[in-house]
């Protein structure tokens, strides 16, 4: 017989020959990392026929991991369903836990003893350190030192000592979140008010308001004859203008130049637009690009 | 608190020209957005324009192509040029800081008289 | 321009009297409404702000009320410091304007 077949799991015991005689019996053992369990036989013998009589490596099992529990408030998971060695076990938490330690361990090989590449890692509670203080304002239970995940704080603006309220400007409510940090930014109170805005051969349509605070919603149109060149409609911002800024209503040209809109409230806007300032002082119509428009 | 007073007021032909002076004291007129407002007896209160803080300006197109508002902020005076004057432009002429950006009047001064007559 | 018609023009009353005055505007203004009170031989000065909003130093006895195109202005029992004549102004709309003036005079 030619050399004997070679497996995965088992190795020939000692050295192979080039050929053997009929009836010539050669054995095999477990290869590193794995043991043999009975019944089946470890050896074969060459056959009258020049073959080897039939003869497999299934007695041989890989070296397993001790078992590893699931951690407190987590989950420990087989990537590949066993513990032989080579196999990996991914470690998560459950919701409102976070993970001390490696979240994977690999089994692995010590001489022939089949160990786990670290220790289990725990899962702690999440906790987070009181959010913070702001100038003007508070928030709910300033007197717990400790937080839990998703515990929530709500922000609320202190009286404005003077005519104009603080407006909380970002998220009223935070909470604990993963990484033991608050979902969000805490909030800022400031007075926050607008200019009357003042748009000159127009009028504001919707949003009337006695004074503009954080986020007023206002909306204009032109007079007959002339067409909004901006935006209708605008928001007071948190740096208290208006965005998108103030629009201007623009005389609707009738020179062969400039197509007229059919529109009193809007319309193509000029070849070049005139710098809209911030609020709400315009250039007088009898200067600069303006000249052309009321022509 | 500013104080706003007004100056320059007289007597004019038709015709004639005159700039009418609004200083600010306790304050910088570059602050604040101020209106001119005259009153006659045969017209009453008619607001003539607004120069805001950015130093654009808005007029009561009745009187936009004779009258002018402008602003020295070296000299903390706010101006009103009058040109072309008539006779009805007799009247109490008022500069008035725009209430925090909203268009109530509520620091009007003593105004300052334009009279126009040959 | 938005026109603003004040009625009545003039009127008397006698210490303690209600007194209202109206001003019509000649389109909708919301309530961009203001009142002022000219003192004989004095500058106006602002009462009421936005339709209603009494300014700082108004007596409680000036009231105002109103929208769109018709405003109240009220002094519940009138004083003989509260003579002059009365203004109303819109601001919806440049130009601002004022209305013709109601001249209030003590019995």
């Known amino acids: 017989c030619e050399a004997p077949p070679t497996f995965e799991a088992m190795e020939l015991i000692g050295k192979p020959k080039p050929y053997y005689r009929v009836g010539e019996r050669v054995d095999y053992k477990c290869k590193k990392g794995y043991f043999y369990i009975p019944p089946l036989a470890t050896h074969t013998i060459c056959d009258r026929n020049h073959t080897w009589l039939p003869v497999s490596d299934e007695g041989c099992y890989r070296e397993m991991c001790p078992h590893i529990r699931d951690p407190l408030n987590g989950e420990a998971i087989l990537a590949n369903g066993s513990y032989e060695f080579g196999a990996e076990l991914h470690f998560i938490c459950n919701e409102g836990y976070y993970l001390i330690g490696k979240d994977i361990l690999y089994c692995e090989l010590k001489d022939t003893v089949a160990i786990w590449s670290g220790k289990p890692p725990l899962c702690e509670k999440i906790l987070c350190t009181p959010p913070p203080k702001i100038k003007n304002g508070k928030h709910t239970f300033s007197e717990v030192e400790v937080f839990e995940y998703l515990d929530a704080v709500t922000y609320s603006c202190d009286p404005a000592p003077g005519p104009d309220p603080f407006s909380l400007i970002g998220e009223s409510m935070i909470y604990c979140g993963n990484n033991s940090t608050w979902s969000h930014a805490a909030p800022e109170c400031k007075v926050v008010k607008c200019r009357f805005p003042v748009v000159e051969n127009g009028k504001q349509i919707s949003g009337f308001g006695k004074k503009f605070y954080y986020k007023a919603t206002v909306m204009f149109e032109c007079d007959k004859g002339y067409y909004l060149n901006g935006s209708d409609k605008i928001v007071c911002e948190s740096n208290s203008t208006w965005d998108p800024p103030v629009p201007k209503c623009l005389k609707v040209s009738t020179s062969p130049t400039t197509k007229s809109p059919t529109s009193s409230a809007s319309g193509p806007r000029p070849t070049y637009k005139p710098p809209v300032s911030n609020y709400p002082g315009y250039p007088k119509p009898d200067e600069g690009i303006l000249n052309n428009l009321d022509d | 608190e500013v104080q706003l007073v007004e100056s320059g007021g007289g007597l004019v032909q038709p015709g004639g020209s005159l700039r009418l002076s609004c200083a600010a004291s306790g304050g910088s007129v570059s602050s604040y957005d101020i209106s001119w407002i005259r009153q006659s007896p045969s017209r009453g209160l008619e607001w003539l324009g607004v120069?805001?803080?950015?130093?654009?300006?808005n007029y009561n197109s009745a009187f936009m192509s004779r009258f002018t508002i402008s602003r020295d902020d070296s000299k903390n005076t706010a101006y009103l040029q009058m040109n072309s004057l008539k006779t009805e432009d007799t009247a109490v002429y008022y500069c008035?800081?725009?209430?925090?950006?909203?268009?109530?009047?509520?620091?009007w001064g003593q105004g300052t008289l334009v009279t126009v007559s040959s | 321009a938005i026109q603003l018609t004040q009625s009545p023009s003039s009127l008397s009353a006698s210490v303690g009297d209600r007194v209202t005055i109206t001003c019509r505007a000649s389109q909708g203004i919301a309530n961009y409404l203001n009142w002022y009170l000219q003192k004989p031989g004095q500058s106006p000065q602002l009462l009421i702000y936005y339709t209603s909003s009494l300014h700082s130093g108004v007596p409680d006895r000036f009231s105002g009320s109103g929208s769109g195109t018709d405003f109240t202005l009220k002094i519940s029992r009138v004083e003989a410091e509260d003579v002059g004549v009365y203004y109303c102004?819109?601001?919806?709309?440049?130009?601002?304007?004022f209305g013709q003036g109601t001249k209030v005079e003590i019995k």
């Open positions: 102004q819109q601001y919806i709309k440049l130009p601002w304007t």
């Open positions: 120069i805001w803080t950015d130093g654009g300006t």
């Open positions: 008035e800081r725009v209430y925090d950006g909203y268009p109530w009047f509520a620091y």
